[in-house]
């Protein structure tokens, strides 16, 4: 049951982000997962590293992966998917999952290639009146239904405010998204929900929009969170450069 000879799925994540690496196998039998092993093969002559193993309802992260890896799949339903949090540069490489069924010699193997990019800026700058895109993407090899995307704002006034909410009720197939409060009609979802992308665009930025924006993407009982700090600077004076004097001329409100 070797999936290693087909080209493995690839994930590209930024340092500090999370990655969900799928390891699901289809079985005609009613047997449950007995043991799971996750190994990292960094390549370039580096030694393989053990990431996590599971047996007898005991999930054990190893070494530097402690507190950063969890089995996220439904083990009873042939899913040994691994969630890697707070991704580091050293985490780059090929992750190999091995699943064993009780009383079977066959081993189901699956690989995922993880590429790690430098950390994305956690702080963004925008001028009053401008527009800004705030990214929030959860990288996963598995197509999982996003059930909710939520953006929460906390500014200097300490009170938390809902910026944007998206729901997807699977049973009723109802999609519902809305921007709230003083963000009403100024926020749009620009990410592709079906690719676990909950990025938003904020337009008509006000000075009071400066603060922390926390995005949470819900995939069933799995929640991915990311916080962005937005700094708002006063409106940029629009300048006109005259070829003769090369001197800036500040335009008034009704001048063109």
């Amino acid at each position: 049951l070797n999936d290693l000879n087909v080209s493995p799925p690839e994930l590209t994540v930024h340092v500090g982000d999370s990655a969900l690496m799928g390891c699901v196998f289809q079985s005609t039998e009613d047997k449950c997962i007995f043991k799971i092993d996750w190994t990292l093969s960094p390549g370039e002559h580096a030694k393989d590293e053990y990431v996590l193993y599971y047996y007898s309802n005991l999930s054990v992260p190893i070494g530097r992966f402690q507190n950063r890896v969890h089995l996220m799949g439904d083990i009873l339903c042939n899913d040994g998917s691994l969630l890697l949090q707070d991704v580091q540069e050293a985490d780059q490489g090929t992750y190999i999952c091995e699943i064993r069924l009780k009383g079977e010699s066959q081993v189901f193997k699956k690989a995922v290639v993880l590429h790690v990019l430098p950390e994305e800026p956690k702080e963004l700058m925008v001028h009053v009146g401008g527009l800004i895109q705030m990214g929030c993407v959860f990288q996963s090899t598995e197509v999982k239904h996003v059930t909710k995307v939520e953006w929460i704002f906390s500014g200097r006034r300490a009170k938390e405010e809902i910026v944007f909410r998206y729901y997807h009720k699977l049973r009723m197939s109802v999609e519902y998204s809305q921007s709230w409060g003083h963000f009403q009609n100024r926020v749009n979802l620009v990410g592709d929900i079906f690719r676990n992308d909950g990025s938003i665009m904020l337009q008509g930025v006000r000075e009071s929009d400066g603060g922390n924006y926390t995005c949470s993407i819900h995939l069933g009982n799995l929640v991915f969170k990311k916080t962005i700090v937005l700094h708002v600077s006063p409106e940029e004076p629009r300048t006109l450069v005259t070829p003769a004097a090369l001197r800036p001329l500040v335009l008034g409100g009704n001048q063109l």
Epitope: D48, Y50, Y55, S56, S59, V60, P61, G63, V107
Partner: antibody
Framework: DVQLVESGAELVRPGASVKLSCKAL????????MHWVKQTPVHGLEWIGI????????VYNQKFKGKATLTADKSSSTAYMELSSLTSEDSTVYYC???????????????WGAG | VLTQSPASLAASVGETVTITCRAS??????LAWYQQKQGKSPQLLIY???SLEDGVPSRFSGSGSGTQYSLKINSMQPEDTATYFC?????????FGAGTKLEL
């Protein structure tokens, strides 16, 4: 040198409890499973259970559930086994042993305490 | 259940010794052999049925598959006098063979 240093012999009354300790030296305590094994002339070596100090997870041999309780203190790199409701049947040698992971679902006891 | 045989045996220096271990079901090479000298704790000799642990003399070897496994000592030495145990790590509860007492 990697070592497991166990507490000494104990003299206890029937019905009482006792807590045995096992201090890990010269390795990262949270990286390895710690197991406890009982040895008697009649039953030979019997596996009691495992604690993984990193995750705090435990698995017990059904036979010792209710008899043994395994705990671990990360700060002192020490594993403990508490035995309750003691009888003469419990009077024997107990080993703590470190289980090393060899990959691909293979694990073996590579370091043992003196008992 | 692991059935180990023989329960005891005596061998001369230079002789080849074989100890066997039979599992009640397939344990897929998840077997180890330990040596325990009088008054000491067990020591790992062989893991994964046939891999020699670091520092163990090459006269020790392991073989087998499925339910049948064996430990071979190629040329018995006086320091090999001990009790030998097999152990299966395929599933919990982990179990040990009853042991084989090897005497000179």
């Amino acid at each position: 040198d990697v070592q497991l240093v166990e507490s000494g012999a104990e003299l206890v009354r029937p019905g009482a409890s006792v807590k045995l300790s096992c201090k890990a030296l010269a390795y990262t305590f949270t990286d390895y499973e710690m197991h406890w094994v009982k040895q008697t002339p009649v039953h030979g070596l019997e596996w009691i259970g495992i604690i993984h100090p990193g995750s705090g997870g435990t698995v017990y041999n059904q036979k010792f559930k209710g008899k043994a309780t395994l705990t671990a203190d990360k700060s002192s790199s020490t594993a403990y086994m508490e035995l309750s409701s003691l009888t003469s049947e419990d009077s024997t040698v107990y080993y703590c042993t470190r289980r090393r992971y060899y990959g691909s679902s293979y694990w073996y006891f590579d370091v043992w305490g003196a008992g | 259940v692991l059935t180990q045989s023989p329960a005891s045996l005596a061998a001369s220096v230079g002789e080849t010794v074989t100890i066997t271990c039979r599992a009640s079901e397939n344990i897929y090479y998840s077997l180890a052999w330990y040596q325990q000298k009088q008054g000491k704790s067990p020591q790992l000799l062989i893991y994964n049925a046939n891999s020699l642990e670091d520092g163990v003399p090459s006269r020790f070897s392991g073989s087998g598959s499925g339910t049948q496994y064996s430990l071979k000592i190629n040329s018995m030495q006086p320091e090999d006098t001990a009790t030998y145990f097999c152990e299966q790590t395929y599933d919990v509860p982990l179990t040990f063979g009853a042991g084989t007492k090897l005497e000179l």
